[in-house]
């Protein structure tokens, strides 16, 4: 037990933030600027992560955690640790090869980002369009063509809500 | 379509100066998210990159030379410039200006280049 | 600087051929990882950026592959026209391009 003791790496006594230094009898020495261990017993220190240029500082880089980056205004995040920035969008729009580009009609987008899709097809459910959609806004179904027959409310009343674990009176 | 012009190459003496112009169109260096740099390649060599400036007037230089480098814009021109001095021998390279990024999606990559500018470094 | 080291330096290859060229980080860089082509008297061209994804009007035989450390460029079919020497290059600190990769005929 002794013997597997004193054959311990000695490098594994350094902490995060510093790499065991070969060239220094073994000592663990501090990360240098720019560069960062998240573990103890590092041989090198990591560079940190550099935001520049679309990409923007979240997180500073420590001597031991990496720098986090986002976006600058006016784009979003895309890929593995934010790898990437997309151009964003209004509502009403997707982008495209040639930039934002309204959504067509019969399709919506009601983010920044991402595609137009299309409106919801209420007559699928056998239901009926209550609001009509828009660039940004989805279709809204209401009920179906027969509840509004003459004599019959245009509106059903909400089903009672039922607490969660109660089974019906 | 965007387009990257570079020129200002030609012979220097050793221990001059240059100063490159990249004419940029089809975009704006001052357009939100832009980054342009410079990059050059030695006869028969590989690339190397050597500045680059975004569209808030952020400079990255490469630490080798960056003591000899200078990356500047002209927003009103649209055009992009890179000063070198104490010239060496080893300097000697085609020159090119590129541009970070592809069209809706930015990063650190180059979708578009200019054709290249010689220079070189003799007595 | 984080160095980037590709391999093989040069092949010889046919058309038709499968062709894989490979680059490795000296540290984890994610996926901040661009490959290039150039041919002779040209600007480089890039081909893929993000390791994986292929830039518009890059045919389809030409896909990237990895993340961290390792990183490989294919070319499915090799055509007359892909004779050239390929480039990585990563962004993931300050810009730097691995040595390149010279893919001639055989």
């Known amino acids: 037990f002794e013997r597997t003791r004193s054959l311990q790496d000695p490098c594994s006594n350094c902490p995060a933030g510093t790499f065991c230094d070969n060239n220094r009898n073994q000592i663990c020495s501090p990360c240098p600027p720019n560069s960062f261990s998240s573990a103890g017993g590092q041989r090198t220190c990591d560079i940190c992560r550099q935001c520049k240029g679309v990409f923007r500082t979240r997180k500073e880089c420590s001597s031991t955690s990496n720098a986090e980056c986002d976006c600058t205004p006016g784009f979003h995040c895309l890929g593995a640790g934010c790898s990437m920035c997309e151009q964003d969008c209004k509502q009403g729009q997707e982008l495209t090869k040639k930039g934002c580009k309204d959504c067509c009609f019969g399709t919506f987008n009601d983010q920044k980002r991402g595609i137009c899709r299309p409106w919801t097809n209420c007559s699928l459910d056998g239901k009926s369009v209550l609001v009509n959609g828009t660039k940004e806004r989805d279709v809204v179904c209401g009920p179906s063509p027969a509840d509004l027959s003459p004599g019959a409310s245009s509106v059903t009343p909400p089903a009672p809500a039922r607490e969660p674990g109660h089974s019906p009176q | 379509e965007v387009q990257l012009v570079e020129s200002g190459g030609g012979l220097v003496q050793p221990g001059g100066s240059l100063r490159l112009s990249c004419a940029a169109s089809g975009f704006s260096l001052s357009t939100s998210g832009v980054g342009v740099g410079w990059i050059r390649q030695a006869p028969g060599k590989g690339l190397e990159w050597l500045a680059l400036i975004d569209w808030a007037d952020d400079k990255y230089y490469s630490p080798s030379l960056k003591s000899r480098l200078t990356i500047s814009r002209d927003n009103s021109k649209n055009t992009l410039y890179l000063q070198l001095n104490s010239l060496r021998a080893e300097d000697t390279a085609v020159y090119y200006c590129?541009?970070?990024?592809?069209?809706?999606?930015?990063?650190?990559?180059?979708?578009?280049w200019g054709q290249g500018t010689l220079v070189t470094v003799s007595s | 600087d984080i160095q980037l080291t590709q391999s093989p330096s040069s092949l010889s290859a046919s058309v038709g051929d499968r062709v894989t060229i490979t680059c490795r980080a000296s540290q984890g860089i994610g996926s901040y990882l661009a490959w290039y082509q150039q041919k002779p008297g040209k600007a480089p061209k890039l081909l893929i950026y993000?390791?994986?994804n292929l830039e518009t009007g890059v045919p389809s035989r030409f896909s990237g592959s990895g993340s961290g450390t390792d990183f490989t460029l294919t070319i499915s079919s090799l055509q007359p026209e892909d004779f050239a020497t390929y480039y990585c290059?990563?962004?993931?600190?300050?810009?730097?391009f691995g040595q390149g990769t010279k893919v001639e005929i055989k």
């Open positions: 590129a541009r970070g990024g592809s069209d809706a999606v930015l990063g650190d990559w180059f979708a578009y």
């Open positions: 993000d390791a994986s």
């Open positions: 290059q990563q962004g993931y600190s300050i810009w730097t």
